[in-house]
Protein backbone atom coordinates (compact mmCIF):
# COMPACT_ATOMS: atom_id res chain seq x y z
CA UNK A 1 0.00 0.00 0.00
CA UNK A 2 1.34 3.42 -0.95
CA UNK A 3 2.10 6.11 1.60
CA UNK A 4 0.14 9.35 1.45
CA UNK A 5 3.14 11.04 -0.19
CA UNK A 6 3.33 8.44 -2.95
CA UNK A 7 -0.42 8.47 -3.53
CA UNK A 8 -0.52 12.25 -3.83
CA UNK A 9 2.48 12.32 -6.17
CA UNK A 10 1.07 9.54 -8.35
CA UNK A 11 -2.29 11.31 -8.59
CA UNK A 12 -0.57 14.48 -9.72
CA UNK A 13 1.57 12.65 -12.26
CA UNK A 14 -1.38 10.74 -13.71
CA UNK A 15 -3.40 13.90 -14.18
CA UNK A 16 -0.59 15.92 -15.72
CA UNK A 17 -2.08 15.67 -19.20
CA UNK A 18 -5.68 16.33 -18.20
CA UNK A 19 -7.10 19.71 -19.09
CA UNK A 20 -10.22 21.50 -18.03
CA UNK A 21 -12.63 23.72 -19.91
CA UNK A 22 -13.02 26.15 -17.06
CA UNK A 23 -11.62 29.64 -17.66
CA UNK A 24 -7.88 29.97 -17.12
CA UNK A 25 -6.50 31.83 -14.14
CA UNK A 26 -5.92 35.34 -15.42
CA UNK A 27 -5.14 37.03 -12.09
CA UNK A 28 -3.74 35.75 -8.83
CA UNK A 29 -6.29 35.18 -6.04
CA UNK A 30 -6.16 37.34 -2.93
CA UNK A 31 -3.11 36.59 -0.72
CA UNK A 32 -1.27 34.95 -3.65
CA UNK A 33 1.78 36.71 -5.11
CA UNK A 34 2.42 36.82 -8.83
CA UNK A 35 5.82 35.72 -10.06
CA UNK A 36 5.86 35.87 -13.85
CA UNK A 37 3.31 33.30 -15.07
CA UNK A 38 2.69 31.81 -11.63
CA UNK A 39 0.81 32.67 -8.47
CA UNK A 40 2.61 31.71 -5.26
CA UNK A 41 1.19 31.30 -1.78
CA UNK A 42 3.69 31.29 1.09
CA UNK A 43 2.26 29.50 4.11
CA UNK A 44 2.37 31.11 7.54
CA UNK A 45 2.14 27.81 9.40
CA UNK A 46 4.44 24.79 9.41
CA UNK A 47 3.78 21.20 8.36
CA UNK A 48 5.60 18.05 7.33
CA UNK A 49 6.09 17.74 3.56
CA UNK A 50 3.20 15.34 2.96
CA UNK A 51 0.68 17.58 4.73
CA UNK A 52 2.03 20.55 2.79
CA UNK A 53 1.49 18.61 -0.44
CA UNK A 54 -2.08 17.85 0.61
CA UNK A 55 -2.76 21.45 1.65
CA UNK A 56 -1.74 22.76 -1.78
CA UNK A 57 -4.03 20.17 -3.38
CA UNK A 58 -7.01 21.44 -1.39
CA UNK A 59 -6.25 24.88 -2.80
CA UNK A 60 -6.32 23.51 -6.37
CA UNK A 61 -2.59 24.11 -6.62
CA UNK A 62 0.63 22.17 -6.17
CA UNK A 63 3.78 22.49 -4.14
CA UNK A 64 6.16 24.81 -5.94
CA UNK A 65 7.91 23.48 -9.04
CA UNK A 66 11.05 25.39 -10.02
CA UNK A 67 12.11 25.27 -13.66
CA UNK A 68 15.63 26.70 -13.41
CA UNK A 69 18.08 28.70 -11.33
CA UNK A 70 16.61 31.99 -12.54
CA UNK A 71 13.16 31.06 -11.21
CA UNK A 72 14.74 29.91 -7.93
CA UNK A 73 16.43 33.29 -7.43
CA UNK A 74 13.24 35.21 -8.19
CA UNK A 75 11.32 33.02 -5.73
CA UNK A 76 13.97 33.47 -3.05
CA UNK A 77 13.71 37.23 -3.50
CA UNK A 78 10.11 36.99 -2.25
CA UNK A 79 11.21 35.38 1.03
CA UNK A 80 11.43 38.16 3.61
CA UNK A 81 13.08 36.35 6.52
CA UNK A 82 16.39 34.63 5.88
CA UNK A 83 15.87 32.15 8.74
CA UNK A 84 12.69 30.62 7.34
CA UNK A 85 12.60 27.45 5.22
CA UNK A 86 9.83 26.49 2.76
CA UNK A 87 9.01 23.09 1.29
CA UNK A 88 8.86 22.82 -2.50
CA UNK A 89 7.60 19.96 -4.66
CA UNK A 90 10.81 17.96 -4.83
CA UNK A 91 11.67 14.83 -2.88
CA UNK A 92 14.13 11.95 -3.09
CA UNK A 93 12.96 8.87 -4.98
CA UNK A 94 14.60 5.86 -3.35
CA UNK A 95 13.69 3.54 -6.23
CA UNK A 96 15.27 5.83 -8.81
CA UNK A 97 17.98 7.16 -6.49
CA UNK A 98 17.37 10.68 -7.72
CA UNK A 99 15.58 13.89 -6.81
CA UNK A 100 12.11 13.84 -8.34
CA UNK A 101 9.61 16.66 -8.84
CA UNK A 102 6.00 15.91 -7.98
CA UNK A 103 5.13 16.17 -11.68
CA UNK A 104 7.27 13.07 -12.29
CA UNK A 105 10.32 14.74 -13.83
CA UNK A 106 13.81 14.47 -12.40
CA UNK A 107 15.96 17.31 -11.15
CA UNK A 108 18.47 18.69 -13.61
CA UNK A 109 21.60 18.60 -11.46
CA UNK A 110 22.62 22.08 -12.64
CA UNK A 111 19.38 23.74 -11.52
CA UNK A 112 19.72 23.66 -7.73
CA UNK A 113 22.78 23.43 -5.51
CA UNK A 114 21.41 21.31 -2.69
CA UNK A 115 22.95 21.42 0.76
CA UNK A 116 22.59 18.09 2.54
CA UNK A 117 22.24 14.45 1.63
CA UNK A 118 20.33 12.83 -1.21
CA UNK A 119 18.81 9.97 0.74
CA UNK A 120 15.60 8.19 1.70
CA UNK A 121 12.91 10.31 3.41
CA UNK A 122 14.47 13.56 2.18
CA UNK A 123 12.62 16.50 0.70
CA UNK A 124 13.79 19.87 -0.56
CA UNK A 125 13.31 23.21 1.11
CA UNK A 126 14.42 26.67 0.08
CA UNK A 127 15.42 29.70 2.09
CA UNK A 128 16.24 33.24 1.07
CA UNK A 129 19.76 32.17 0.13
CA UNK A 130 20.00 28.37 -0.12
CA UNK A 131 18.42 25.03 -1.03
CA UNK A 132 18.41 22.30 1.61
CA UNK A 133 17.72 18.60 1.92
CA UNK A 134 15.61 17.99 5.04
CA UNK A 135 13.75 15.03 6.50
CA UNK A 136 10.30 15.19 4.89
CA UNK A 137 8.79 14.55 8.31
CA UNK A 138 10.07 17.75 9.87
CA UNK A 139 7.75 20.76 10.12
CA UNK A 140 8.52 23.88 8.11
CA UNK A 141 6.51 26.32 5.97
CA UNK A 142 5.68 25.62 2.33
CA UNK A 143 4.94 27.30 -1.00
CA UNK A 144 1.96 26.45 -3.21
CA UNK A 145 1.77 27.47 -6.86
CA UNK A 146 -0.98 28.02 -9.41
CA UNK A 147 -0.18 28.52 -13.09
CA UNK A 148 -1.47 31.68 -14.75
CA UNK A 149 -2.71 30.20 -18.02
CA UNK A 150 -5.26 31.27 -20.61
CA UNK A 151 -8.52 29.38 -21.16
CA UNK A 152 -7.32 25.76 -21.08
CA UNK A 153 -5.25 25.05 -18.02
CA UNK A 154 -3.80 21.95 -16.45
CA UNK A 155 -5.31 20.94 -13.14
CA UNK A 156 -3.76 19.59 -9.99
CA UNK A 157 -6.44 17.31 -8.49
CA UNK A 158 -7.34 17.04 -4.84
CA UNK A 159 -5.53 14.10 -3.32
Amino acid sequence: QKSSIEKCSVDIQQSRNKTTERPGLLNCPIYWQQLREKCLLFSHTVNPWNNSLADCSTKESSLLLIRDKDELIHTQNLIRDKAILFWIGLNFSLSEKNWKWINGSFLNSNDLEIRGDAKENSCISISQTSVYSEYCSTEIRWICQKELTPVRNKVYPDS
Epitope: S4, H44, V46
Partner: antibody
Framework: QVQLVQSGAEVKKPGASVKVSCKAS????????MHWVRQAPGQGLEWMGW????????NYAQKFQGRVTMTRDTSINTAYMELSRLRSDDTAVYYC????????WGQGTLVTVSS | DIQMTQSPSSLSASVGDRVTITCRAS??????LAWFQQKPGKAPKSLIY???SLQSGVPSKFSGSGSGTDFTLTISSLQPEDFATYYC?????????FGQGTKLEIK
Amino acid sequence: QVQLVQSGAEVKKPGASVKVSCKASGYTFTGYYMHWVRQAPGQGLEWMGWINPNSGGTNYAQKFQGRVTMTRDTSINTAYMELSRLRSDDTAVYYCARGAWGSNWGQGTLVTVSS
Amino acid sequence: DIQMTQSPSSLSASVGDRVTITCRASQGISNYLAWFQQKPGKAPKSLIYAASSLQSGVPSKFSGSGSGTDFTLTISSLQPEDFATYYCQQYNSYPYTFGQGTKLEIK
Protein backbone atom coordinates in the same frame (compact mmCIF):
# COMPACT_ATOMS: atom_id res chain seq x y z
CA GLN B 1 9.36 29.13 26.84
CA VAL B 2 6.44 27.49 25.04
CA GLN B 3 3.42 26.96 27.27
CA LEU B 4 -0.06 25.59 26.60
CA VAL B 5 -2.44 26.17 29.48
CA GLN B 6 -5.82 24.44 29.40
CA SER B 7 -9.09 25.19 31.16
CA GLY B 8 -10.17 23.32 34.28
CA ALA B 9 -11.95 20.02 34.78
CA GLU B 10 -15.59 19.70 33.74
CA VAL B 11 -18.44 17.42 34.77
CA LYS B 12 -21.20 17.04 32.19
CA LYS B 13 -24.40 15.10 31.74
CA PRO B 14 -24.89 12.76 28.77
CA GLY B 15 -26.16 14.69 25.74
CA ALA B 16 -24.54 17.95 26.85
CA SER B 17 -21.59 19.75 25.23
CA VAL B 18 -18.21 20.73 26.60
CA LYS B 19 -15.79 23.40 25.40
CA VAL B 20 -12.14 23.13 26.40
CA SER B 21 -9.72 26.01 25.91
CA CYS B 22 -5.96 26.00 25.33
CA LYS B 23 -4.06 29.27 25.77
CA ALA B 24 -0.69 29.40 24.01
CA SER B 25 2.32 31.52 24.92
CA GLY B 26 6.03 31.64 24.18
CA TYR B 27 5.74 31.22 20.40
CA THR B 28 3.84 32.57 17.40
CA PHE B 29 0.38 31.07 17.90
CA THR B 30 -0.56 31.29 14.22
CA GLY B 31 2.62 29.51 13.14
CA TYR B 32 1.77 25.97 14.27
CA TYR B 33 -1.26 23.73 13.86
CA MET B 34 -2.93 22.90 17.16
CA HIS B 35 -3.89 19.26 17.56
CA TRP B 36 -6.28 17.76 20.06
CA VAL B 37 -5.74 14.32 21.60
CA ARG B 38 -7.74 12.54 24.26
CA GLN B 39 -7.01 9.76 26.73
CA ALA B 40 -9.71 7.75 28.45
CA PRO B 41 -8.91 6.59 32.02
CA GLY B 42 -6.23 3.90 31.94
CA GLN B 43 -6.22 3.90 28.13
CA GLY B 44 -3.97 5.06 25.32
CA LEU B 45 -3.90 8.24 23.27
CA GLU B 46 -6.44 9.06 20.54
CA TRP B 47 -6.00 11.83 17.97
CA MET B 48 -9.10 13.98 17.40
CA GLY B 49 -8.01 16.51 14.79
CA TRP B 50 -6.33 19.85 14.25
CA ILE B 51 -6.99 23.50 13.66
CA ASN B 52 -4.80 25.85 11.64
CA PRO B 53 -4.77 28.93 13.88
CA ASN B 54 -3.74 31.13 10.96
CA SER B 55 -6.65 30.32 8.63
CA GLY B 56 -9.11 28.64 10.99
CA GLY B 57 -9.10 25.54 8.76
CA THR B 58 -9.75 22.23 10.49
CA ASN B 59 -9.33 18.50 9.94
CA TYR B 60 -11.21 16.11 12.21
CA ALA B 61 -10.82 12.38 12.70
CA GLN B 62 -13.75 10.56 11.08
CA LYS B 63 -14.78 9.19 14.47
CA PHE B 64 -15.55 12.70 15.75
CA GLN B 65 -16.99 14.25 12.58
CA GLY B 66 -20.28 15.99 13.33
CA ARG B 67 -19.63 16.13 17.09
CA VAL B 68 -16.40 18.08 17.37
CA THR B 69 -15.75 21.73 16.53
CA MET B 70 -12.33 23.31 16.79
CA THR B 71 -12.05 27.09 16.78
CA ARG B 72 -9.50 29.72 17.76
CA ASP B 73 -9.28 33.33 18.87
CA THR B 74 -6.01 34.78 17.61
CA SER B 75 -6.46 37.97 19.63
CA ILE B 76 -5.92 35.98 22.83
CA ASN B 77 -3.79 33.13 21.39
CA THR B 78 -6.34 30.53 22.38
CA ALA B 79 -7.61 27.38 20.69
CA TYR B 80 -10.89 25.70 21.61
CA MET B 81 -12.28 22.21 21.23
CA GLU B 82 -16.01 21.68 21.65
CA LEU B 83 -17.48 18.18 21.80
CA SER B 84 -21.25 17.81 21.65
CA ARG B 85 -23.76 15.04 22.36
CA LEU B 86 -21.53 13.71 25.10
CA ARG B 87 -21.67 10.05 26.10
CA SER B 88 -20.18 8.28 29.10
CA ASP B 89 -17.37 6.91 26.93
CA ASP B 90 -16.26 10.49 26.19
CA THR B 91 -14.97 10.64 29.77
CA ALA B 92 -11.29 11.35 29.23
CA VAL B 93 -8.46 13.80 29.65
CA TYR B 94 -8.36 16.12 26.63
CA TYR B 95 -5.02 17.57 25.55
CA CYS B 96 -4.00 20.25 23.10
CA ALA B 97 -0.63 19.70 21.44
CA ARG B 98 1.46 21.96 19.23
CA GLY B 99 2.42 20.68 15.79
CA ALA B 100 2.22 17.36 13.98
CA TRP B 101 4.38 15.47 16.45
CA GLY B 102 3.23 17.24 19.60
CA SER B 103 6.40 19.10 20.50
CA ASN B 104 4.51 20.72 23.40
CA TRP B 105 1.35 19.65 25.24
CA GLY B 106 -1.15 21.31 27.51
CA GLN B 107 -1.54 19.90 31.02
CA GLY B 108 -4.81 18.23 30.08
CA THR B 109 -8.45 18.82 30.96
CA LEU B 110 -10.46 16.05 32.60
CA VAL B 111 -13.99 15.84 31.22
CA THR B 112 -16.28 13.52 33.17
CA VAL B 113 -19.58 12.53 31.59
CA SER B 114 -21.96 11.11 34.14
CA SER B 115 -25.68 11.13 34.81
CA ASP C 1 -6.38 3.78 9.33
CA ILE C 2 -2.77 2.90 10.04
CA GLN C 3 -2.39 0.59 13.04
CA MET C 4 0.62 1.09 15.29
CA THR C 5 1.67 -1.93 17.35
CA GLN C 6 4.17 -1.58 20.17
CA SER C 7 6.08 -4.36 21.82
CA PRO C 8 6.42 -5.31 24.53
CA SER C 9 3.29 -3.99 26.24
CA SER C 10 5.18 -3.91 29.52
CA LEU C 11 8.79 -4.27 30.44
CA SER C 12 10.64 -4.66 33.74
CA ALA C 13 14.19 -3.38 33.88
CA SER C 14 16.79 -2.16 36.36
CA VAL C 15 18.53 1.17 36.75
CA GLY C 16 21.51 1.25 34.36
CA ASP C 17 19.93 -1.18 31.88
CA ARG C 18 19.73 -0.49 28.17
CA VAL C 19 16.19 -1.04 26.88
CA THR C 20 14.64 -1.12 23.44
CA ILE C 21 10.96 -0.65 22.59
CA THR C 22 9.69 -1.44 19.11
CA CYS C 23 6.82 0.01 17.11
CA ARG C 24 5.45 -1.50 13.92
CA ALA C 25 3.17 0.30 11.46
CA SER C 26 0.55 -1.62 9.47
CA GLN C 27 1.79 0.13 6.32
CA GLY C 28 4.82 2.19 5.35
CA ILE C 29 5.03 5.59 7.03
CA SER C 30 8.47 6.68 5.78
CA ASN C 31 9.97 8.26 8.91
CA TYR C 32 6.87 10.18 10.01
CA LEU C 33 7.11 8.78 13.51
CA ALA C 34 7.30 10.33 16.97
CA TRP C 35 7.96 8.89 20.44
CA PHE C 36 6.49 10.19 23.71
CA GLN C 37 7.04 9.57 27.38
CA GLN C 38 4.11 9.82 29.79
CA LYS C 39 4.17 9.65 33.56
CA PRO C 40 1.03 9.01 35.66
CA GLY C 41 -1.21 12.06 35.86
CA LYS C 42 0.96 14.04 33.46
CA ALA C 43 0.75 15.05 29.81
CA PRO C 44 2.86 13.17 27.26
CA LYS C 45 6.31 14.62 26.59
CA SER C 46 7.88 14.60 23.13
CA LEU C 47 11.16 12.67 22.91
CA ILE C 48 11.79 11.92 19.25
CA TYR C 49 10.36 13.13 15.95
CA ALA C 50 11.12 12.12 12.35
CA ALA C 51 11.91 8.63 13.74
CA SER C 52 15.40 9.59 14.90
CA SER C 53 15.58 13.34 15.63
CA LEU C 54 15.90 14.23 19.29
CA GLN C 55 13.45 16.83 20.56
CA SER C 56 15.16 19.91 21.98
CA GLY C 57 16.02 19.49 25.66
CA VAL C 58 15.73 15.69 25.66
CA PRO C 59 18.83 13.86 26.93
CA SER C 60 20.91 11.98 24.39
CA LYS C 61 20.40 8.66 26.20
CA PHE C 62 17.16 8.50 24.19
CA SER C 63 17.57 7.51 20.55
CA GLY C 64 15.23 6.43 17.78
CA SER C 65 15.75 4.54 14.56
CA GLY C 66 13.83 2.93 11.74
CA SER C 67 11.98 3.76 8.55
CA GLY C 68 9.03 2.34 6.66
CA THR C 69 7.21 0.02 9.05
CA ASP C 70 9.66 -0.88 11.83
CA PHE C 71 10.93 1.53 14.45
CA THR C 72 12.77 1.38 17.75
CA LEU C 73 13.23 3.62 20.77
CA THR C 74 16.34 2.90 22.82
CA ILE C 75 17.18 4.21 26.27
CA SER C 76 20.88 3.65 26.79
CA SER C 77 21.14 3.72 30.57
CA LEU C 78 17.94 3.72 32.59
CA GLN C 79 17.56 6.20 35.41
CA PRO C 80 14.76 6.21 38.02
CA GLU C 81 13.02 9.10 36.21
CA ASP C 82 12.77 7.05 32.99
CA PHE C 83 10.22 4.59 34.39
CA ALA C 84 7.04 5.63 32.58
CA THR C 85 4.81 4.65 29.67
CA TYR C 86 6.13 5.22 26.14
CA TYR C 87 4.01 5.75 23.04
CA CYS C 88 4.82 5.90 19.35
CA GLN C 89 2.72 7.97 16.93
CA GLN C 90 2.56 8.08 13.15
CA TYR C 91 1.89 11.39 11.42
CA ASN C 92 2.21 10.13 7.87
CA SER C 93 -1.53 10.12 7.16
CA TYR C 94 -4.82 11.01 8.80
CA PRO C 95 -6.05 10.04 11.23
CA TYR C 96 -2.82 10.19 13.17
CA THR C 97 -2.58 7.07 15.31
CA PHE C 98 -0.68 5.99 18.41
CA GLY C 99 0.68 2.71 19.60
CA GLN C 100 -1.04 1.17 22.61
CA GLY C 101 1.87 2.07 24.87
CA THR C 102 4.75 0.27 26.59
CA LYS C 103 4.87 0.47 30.38
CA LEU C 104 8.44 0.48 31.66
CA GLU C 105 8.61 -0.66 35.28
CA ILE C 106 11.38 -1.05 37.83
CA LYS C 107 12.48 -4.64 38.32
